[in-house]
């Protein structure tokens, strides 16, 4: 679809005659009538098969014609085409003489026609216009005529239509051979395609205007390209979606439990050294002068009764001292300057000579001791409390309290914590050292096999054309992350290329 | 050859949600050509453009009834869906689910058989 | 909002020519649709992108869009034709459809 467009610009018949030779009364009132057709050798008469056009009288004998283009006028004389612009034609020209008001061809004499102009040549579509000057022996004619397309046709032959559109079905505007240039931030055959934010993750990102990045289930981060970890994952990351992978030192199927209390919460105190033993459970050890479980306890040196033979303890800044008894001397009271004449044992003990009398030794009745006999017996020494038990002088006798999970006289025996069914669903129970375990049958997990979780829905393997799949525990389903070129929950569609269409 | 096949109920109270669903059948609702739109048409009178959805989820809606519509899509089972709130008698109307093709310039070369929706107490 | 509008209805005689007009603000610059649509079906597409024809919609069938004004137009019309055609057109991502006109084979 275009317009043949023919610009009059001068007509001169200076002598005022017609055709005939026969002068114009007054004078020659002058309209064009104009034919457009389609190519031919020699320019005949018949159909003017590309339009017609017809003037007013725009003067007497020689005058220039106005451009009136801009004000609505007839100049350029308009012929329009709904076709294909063939790039030839034909083109007659003829200047009339109107004798009154009624232009139409029958209502004139014949002899009326003042001249007659045939071209015909190549034309190809284009801003620029062409310059011709035909002359007679009587007139002459000058004219400018191009071939221009319609709004929204474009292309050599004015065959293409294109509409710049900027709504869902394509955001574009139209180069002059009628295809289509995408506006910024747009893509594909029909620009309805948006460019995302760059970096855009491709597979796990998608966008529905441009420089936007929208995540697909299970990923998330500005460009889509950091994956959700499984939901109340603690202290876990994640390398695909749903996954929590535990830091160091945390457990369990959200990283919640406490591999590493040592690190994380520091127990020991007074310079102990800490050593984890199992889920939130340590040990510390001591240094000299602390006990307790966490260390906190700072022990008097004297406790441990250094001072033999009835020597008295003090204790210091920087340590003990002994006061030691008449007859007795050393750091802790070890020596003696007694002998058995001197009756040096206490509380029937039997005194043996030694050393030619030099030294001696008492045998004490049972229940004391000391190297006079002079101290009870502290049925603790010898440590008897098995399993981390606190030994407890009572009197003549003794007891040991024992540490949560221990029982028995010398806490000799472990408390069964299996004893009271803790492990839910079927889960089976392992005492431990230090608490105990439980193993959970298939899609039962948590420290007592009390939370539901997933059998793995990836099992099936339900995703297609290669897909990635991820199994999403909180909601026993799974997800496909799709290869390049698929979609669906399965990837299981490829992702459509426009169709082709008969025109 | 592809097909589209509207679903939901006929009847719908005054100030309810009205609820629809097209399935696609013989084609893949993912294809980047087509967006899927729904249109309705009150008894003895013209069509009314209500919106429409493209695989990736983009919508885009008539703007007199914004407030009221959603569309959505389901790629895994080939459908889309509409939900129409705070429906009135002026709702009663036939719904028709309709293929607009990008290539077509948003022509719709395929439509369903239409269901009939009826706004009433 | 845009609008689209349609003569409520037009007359042809078997064979003749009937030519159905869609009139809007600068309607030359949108690509203009039709639909056909019988009594009791769904409608069909029947032009596109002003002027093109979908498969299987006969010859008789065509269009033209310039200006404000889109035209439907049935050459030979057949008893077959007569049914409501309803012109459609994007006003920025918002479709909108003419009135309807009915066409009625004399």
């Known amino acids: 679809s275009g317009v043949f467009q023919l610009q009059l610009q001068e007509f001169i018949n200076e002598r005022g005659v017609l055709a005939s030779g026969r002068p114009c009364e007054p004078g020659c009132r002058t309209f064009f009538r104009v034919c457009l057709k389609h190519f031919q050798a020699v320019v005949s008469p018949g159909p003017c098969t590309f339009g017609t056009v017809s003037t007013p009288v725009l003067g007497t004998n020689s005058f220039a014609v106005r451009d009136d283009s801009s004000g609505g006028g007839r100049n350029p004389l308009q012929l329009p085409f709904n076709f294909t612009w063939p790039g030839t034609f034909s083109l007659i020209i003829e200047a009339w003489h109107a004798p009154g008001d009624d232009l139409r061809p029958e209502a004139l004499p014949p002899d009326a026609l003042i001249s007659k102009i045939a071209i015909q040549g190549s034309l190809a579509v284009g801003q620029n216009w062409l310059l011709d000057e035909q002359t007679s022996t009587l007139t002459r004619l000058r004219y400018s005529y191009r071939v221009i397309c319609s709004d929204n046709y474009y292309g050599d032959n004015c065959s293409r239509l294109c509409k710049k559109r900027n709504d869902h079905f394509g955001h574009y505007v139209c180069q002059p051979d009628g295809n289509l240039s995408c506006l910024p931030g747009w893509t594909g055959e029909y620009c309805q395609q948006p460019i995302c934010l760059s970096g855009c993750h491709e597979q796990n990102g998608y966008c529905s205007k441009p420089a936007e990045c929208l995540c697909r289930p299970g990923w998330q981060g500005r460009l889509c390209n950091e994956c959700i970890p499984h939901n109340g994952c603690r202290h876990g990351t994640c390398s695909t979606p749903w996954q929590c992978t535990c830091d160091e030192g945390w457990g369990g199927l959200f990283c919640d439990q406490d591999l590493n209390y040592c690190t994380h919460h520091s127990p020991c105190k007074n310079g102990a050294t800490c050593s984890n033993s199992g889920q939130r459970s340590y040990t510390c050890t001591c240094r000299p002068g602390y006990t307790g479980v966490d260390c906190e306890l700072e022990l008097s040196e004297c406790d441990s009764n250094p001072c033999r033979n009835g020597g008295s303890c003090k204790d210091q800044e920087d340590g003990y001292h002994c006061l030691c008894p008449p007859g007795y001397y050393g750091l802790h009271c070890e020596h003696s300057t007694l002998s058995c004449a001197d009756s040096p044992c206490f509380n029937g003990g039997s005194c043996r000579e030694r050393n030619q009398g030099a030294n001696y030794a008492c045998e004490c009745p049972p229940n004391f001791t000391g190297s006079n006999c002079e101290k009870k017996v502290d049925r603790c020494t010898s440590n008897p409390c098995a399993n981390g038990g606190q030994c407890l002088n009572r009197g003549p006798s003794r007891m040991c309290r024992c540490r949560p999970g221990f029982t028995g006289t010398y806490c000799e025996l472990h408390v069964s914590d299996c004893a009271r069914n803790p492990c839910a669903h079927g889960g089976t129970c392992h005492d431990l050292e230090n608490g105990l375990m439980c193993t959970c049958p298939a899609g039962f997990s948590g420290r007592r096999c009390e939370v539901r979780t997933s059998i793995d829905a990836c099992a099936s393997s339900p995703c297609f054309n290669r897909a990635t799949c991820y199994t999403d525990l909180s909601t026993d389903t799974f997800v496909c992350n799709c290869p390049y070129g698929f979609v669906g929950s399965r990837c299981e569609f490829p992702v459509g290329l426009p169709p082709s269409f008969p025109w | 050859e592809v097909q589209l096949q509207e679903s939901g109920p006929g009847l719908v109270k005054p100030s309810e949600t009205l609820s629809l669903t097209c399935t696609v059948s013989g084609g893949s609702i993912s294809s980047s050509s087509y967006y899927w739109g729904w249109i309705r048409q009150p008894p003895g009178k013209g069509l009314e453009w209500i919106g429409d959805?493209?695989?990736?989820?983009?919508?885009y809606y008539n703007p007199s009834l914004k407030s009221r519509v959603t569309i959505s899509v389901d790629t895994s089972k080939n459908q889309f869906s509409l939900k129409l709130s705070s429906v009135t008698a002026a709702d009663t109307a036939v719904y028709y689910c309709?293929?607009?093709?990008?290539?077509?310039?948003?022509?719709?070369?395929?439509w369903g058989q239409g269901t009939l929706v009826t706004v009433s107490s | 909002s845009y609008e689209l509008t349609q003569p409520p209805s037009v007359s042809v005689s078997p064979g003749q020519t009937a030519s159905i007009t869609c009139s809007g603000q600068?309607?030359?610059?949108?690509?203009a649709s039709w639909y056909q649509q019988k009594p009791g079906q769904s409608p069909v597409l029947v032009i596109y992108?002003?002027?093109k024809r979908p498969s299987g919609i006969p010859e008789r069938f065509s269009g033209s869009n310039s200006g404000d004004t889109a035209t439907l137009t049935i050459s030979g019309t057949q008893p077959m034709d007569e049914a409501d055609y309803y012109c459609?057109?994007?006003?920025?991502?918002?479709?909108?459809f003419g009135y309807g006109t009915k066409v009625t084979v004399l």
């Open positions: 459609q057109a994007w006003d920025r991502d918002t479709g909108v």
């Open positions: 309709a293929r607009e093709g990008v290539p077509l310039g948003g022509g719709a070369d395929k």
């Open positions: 600068r309607l030359g610059d949108k690509y």
């Open positions: 959805i493209y695989y990736t989820g983009s919508t």
């Open positions: 992108e002003d002027s």
